[in-house]
Amino acid sequence: LDSPDRPWSPLTFSPAQLTVQEGENATFTCSLADIPDSFVLNWYRLSPRNQTDKLAAFQEDRIEPGRDRRFRVTRLPNGRDFHMSIVAARLNDSGIYLCGAIYLPPNTQINESPRAELSVTERTLEPPTQSPSPPPRLSGQLQGLVIGVTSVLVGVLLLLLLTWVLAAVFPRATRGACVCGSEDEPLKEGPDAAPVFTLDYGELDFQWREKTPEPPAPCAPEQTEYATIVFPGRPASPGRRASASSLQGAQPPSPEDGPGLWPL
């Protein structure tokens, strides 16, 4: 073992004990005394039966990830230190870890580092203070309460926004105004649109369209097409009635009701 042609002295694997909260990264450092020309560096976890389970490896400037991509090996700039990290550590990652180096031919040699212990602790909501922290169950209830209240507030705000949008859109629609995208951008549905509760009324079957086509209101061309539903304030005529079968969900107010907003 102490032969003068030994490629490098035994590996170090630091720290001897590492304690992390669950969800944080757990990083060990495997260090070589010097940098051999050709080597393989393996990262192991010791199984309950004292077997070494390989987690990841580094060979010839190439990282070989294991089955679990949370286990990562990174070579540091100094060339002789390797970070062996568990990304977002879990409670069951607690255990004994080590690294092993295989010096490739002509001077084949295998070195194993000392073992190190990882302890993953349950996450606490805030760092420990002088006063005792409340039990986890209570903090969970508080968290649920906060989420609930926030959800209600967001819902109320969205309803107010929807009411405002509808109030802004439909009076203009009754005067024959064109609904264009510039002012009414919140109505646009798309991946970057704000979440707005929409009611799907299906396809309106206007049978009169073939006989008396109406010229559309002048409108600047744009990418997205919008349909404007106009409920004129004149008596109902059979030719302008939407077929009931084509309506889904809530029914719009009948023309007899006169102009008005959709019920919320």
Partner: nanobody, 123 residues
Amino acid sequence: QVQLQQSGGGLVQAGGSLRVSCAASGRTFSSYGMGWFRQAPGKEREFVAAISWSGGTQYYADSAKGRFTISRDNAKNTVYLQMNSLKPEDTAVYYCADYTDYVVYRPQEIGYWGQGTQVTVKP
């Protein structure tokens, strides 16, 4: 310029306890964290323990395992090393270290040091 001001230490009987502390100033707390090294007479400076600034991660050398506890108080920008069950071989000058990126275990890779605190454990 980072400045690390150490306090604590002293003389204690074997089996006793001591606490050393290190207050950091002149820095923003974007660095990784802080740690402790020690240097016994005639020996090289060696890693003892370290802690991340979140406090969620602690690192211990084999010599400190189970006996020493590192902690921090971010409000005071201070790191503590609580040493229990002290042995005569723990006698050394203890140095506070500042980590700017990640934990390292070689003293030559540390950027800033405290002035050192003598800890002497009598048999």
